[in-house]
Interface confidence: low
Amino acid sequence: MMTGTIETTGNISAEKGGSIILQCHLSSTTAQVTQVNWEQQDQLLAICNADLGWHISPSFKDRVAPGPGLGLTLQSLTVNDTGEYFCIYHTYPDGTYTGRIFLEVLESSVAEHGARFQIP
């Protein structure tokens, strides 16, 4: 039975050219996290594997930085980065948990950053 819940930074906005931290946190379960995937729509951005560590997709390696924690830092934002991002937690024995974050990249210099938290 899957008892866990995913907390995320929710809907966030950031300025074009800036950076933002995407964060998810899995709570209310004792399941072991074996891997976390970060995806943007259907594109894989990064993987953090319990045995192999971080892997950043080659097409994003110049603009995506790992961490902090299981989070992901997006840099040099463009308006094309606007959209849905998913953190996919692979766990044992529970299975897969998915969290959703919507990022809006604004041209304006008055972009309001959503609440951000760090793990642990």
Epitope: C48, A50, P66, G67, G69, L70, I119
Partner: nanobody, 116 residues
């Protein structure tokens, strides 16, 4: 069995420096990140800094520009160089693999006291 041993703590005056070390045995951190964490009296443990294979580093805002994290994978050791120390840096400092969600092994910690 995984063992982490932190060392290098002590009493230092405000503005002073310390270098902490974390030696790991029974595992290797070369394929993951190493993190330093701290726990002040009466507070929850908080993340301080992390270093990824290849040297990428990131820091908590409270220590940015003052602390430097590094790792020597050949020695399986992580370091935390702490400069311009403040009384609020007083805490027990721990190292662990980061993200800790992927297997949280903790050592006994090393106490850093910043006081005049």
């Amino acid at each position: 069995e995984v063992q982490l041993v932190e060392s290098g703590g002590g009493l230092v005056q405000p503005g002073g420096s310390l270098r902490l070390s974390c030696a790991a045995s029974g595992t290797t951190f070369s394929s993951a990140a190493m993190g330093w964490f701290r726990q002040a009296p009466g507070k929850e443990r908080e993340w301080v800094a992390s270093v990824l294979r290849g040297g990428y580093t990131w820091y908590a805002d409270s220590v940015k520009g003052r602390f430097t994290i590094s790792a020597d994978n050949s020695k399986n050791t992580a370091y935390l160089q702490m400069n311009s120390l403040k009384p609020e840096d007083t805490a027990v400092y721990y190292c662990a693999r980061d993200p800790v969600e992927l297997g949280d092994y903790w050592g006994q910690g090393t106490l850093v006291t910043v006081s005049s």
